[in-house]
Every structure is written in C-alpha cells, then in structure tokens.
C-alpha cells in the first residue's frame, strides 16, 4: 500500500488512514450529489468480498467523463495490487447486474464503513 502515499502526506500512508480517506471521499460524493451522479451511468455490481477493491476499480474505470469519481478511481488503484484498465473484468466477479454509479458508491461506502469499524484495513 505504499503507492497510496501522496494523497494526504508525502510518505507511505498507513492502511487505516488510506481506508478512512477513501470513506471520506465517498461520503463527499454522496453528500455533494445534486444532479444524478455521472449522468446516470451504469456499472457492474460487485460482490463486496475478497478482491473487492480491484473489482470496484474494474467496474468504475469504465465510466468516462465523470470528474466526480476520478479521485475515487485513483484511490482504489492504490488498494489494487495489479494494473486495471477499461474493459477489464476479473473472472472472479460475476457480471449479473448493472446499477447506477450513485447506488454503487452508496453500497461501497456502507461496506467500507463496516470494514473500518471492524478494523479490517487491507
């Protein structure tokens, strides 16, 4: 997680800090949402289990021209050990339904808050 350095401080960011900053960014997105987020773009829903960060990035990276989630995309890349590019989707994640980005962000936020409370920072 050393690549997370640079979001808030010059050195490596502790996992707990990185997760807290991601949560704060998602809170910021949901609270500042006036018009439909990303113009109602649809993304693949994911299983909020193992490999969740990469799966979330794989899903959100397909959204183009949405400045509101660009920081989230960058932050998620710090949690994912491999490079993710648009159109990529791990065989670990089933493509069963698409949801609006706004709902995706809300679902992800709820889950990350739960992980933070339980002390699961990686």
């Amino acid at each position: 997680l050393t690549c997370l350095g640079g979001f808030a401080s010059p050195g490596p960011v502790p996992p707990s800090t990185a997760l807290r900053e991601l949560i704060e960014e998602l809170v910021n997105i949901t609270q500042n949402q006036k018009a439909p987020l990303c113009n109602g773009s649809m993304v693949w829903s994911i299983n909020l289990t193992a490999g969740m960060y990469c799966a979330a990035l794989e899903s959100l990276i397909n959204v183009s021209g949405c400045s509101a989630i660009e920081k989230t995309q960058r932050m998620l890349s710090g949690f994912c050990p491999h490079k993710v590019s648009a159109g990529q989707f791990s065989s670990l994640h089933v493509r069963d339904t698409k949801i609006e980005v706004a709902q995706f962000v809300k679902d992800l936020l709820l889950h990350l808050k739960k992980l933070f409370r339980e002390g699961q920072f990686n």
Epitope: P36, C38, N39, G40, S41, M42, V43, N62, V63, S64, G65, C66, A86, G87, R95
Partner: nanobody, 116 residues
Framework: EVQLLESGGGLVQPGGSLRLSCAAS????????MDWVRQAPGKGLEWVST????????YYADSVKGRFTISRDNSKNTLYLQMNSLRAEDTAVYYC?????????WGQGTLVTVSS
C-alpha cells in the same frame, strides 16, 4: 460527438414481440460494449442488457432473461434488442447507451407500451 438514435417501440399486446434498434455514430462503435437501459413511468433507471464489443458476451437482467435477446451489427453501427413474451411490466422508455457514459449521450429513447 456521440449520437444514439433508438427506434422500434410501439404498442403491443401481452405476449407479443418487438425489435428495437439503435443507430450509433460519432465513435468507434465496434470498440465498445453497449447497454440497453429502460425507465418505466415514474420509476428509476433499470439496466436491461449489455453486449461486448464483438458480440461474444451478452448479459441480461433477471427480469428479461430468456425473453430478450441483445445483438449488434458492427458493420452497420447498429445495436438491437429482440423482445419476446412481453409483459405489462416491460412498459418503459428504452434507451441504448455506450458503456460508461450517462444520459448526456443517450438518444430520446423509444417507448414500449405493453397493454391489452
């Protein structure tokens, strides 16, 4: 500029069929996955189906699985949705969408009304 123009909607009886088309321009159609999304009166957006760039992967919402078929003709820059065994709950405005873009790039949609 991305442009999408849906057509083929109309009034149909329950159990009937329709074929929707979406003519795309302004981008490399064959390079992108495409979606069908719908909005029922007074409801939110609902994803219907997605097809991969070359058409090898097709995905459907549970509510339409086995009844709807998505396809594409990259030589004509056109996306299709064959809708069979239509139900009243399929009544909605149907939009096609380039994956990863929101309604800023959608067309006007095509209205499908299922009623006896």
């Amino acid at each position: 500029e991305v442009q999408l123009l849906e057509s083929g909607g109309g009034l149909v009886q329950p159990g009937g069929s329709l074929r929707l088309s979406c003519a795309a321009s302004g981008f490399t159609f064959a390079g992108y996955s495409m979606d069908w999304v719908r909005q029922a009166p007074g409801k939110g957006l609902e994803w219907v189906s997605t097809i991969s760039p070359r058409g090898g992967g097709t995905y459907y919402a549970d509510s339409v699985k086995g009844r709807f078929t998505i396809s594409r003709d990259n030589s004509k820059n056109t996306l299709y949705l064959q809708m069979n065994s239509l139900r009243a709950e399929d009544t909605a405005v149907y939009y096609c969408a380039k994956e990863g873009t929101g309604f800023a790039y959608w067309g006007q949609g095509t209205l499908v009304t299922v009623s006896s």
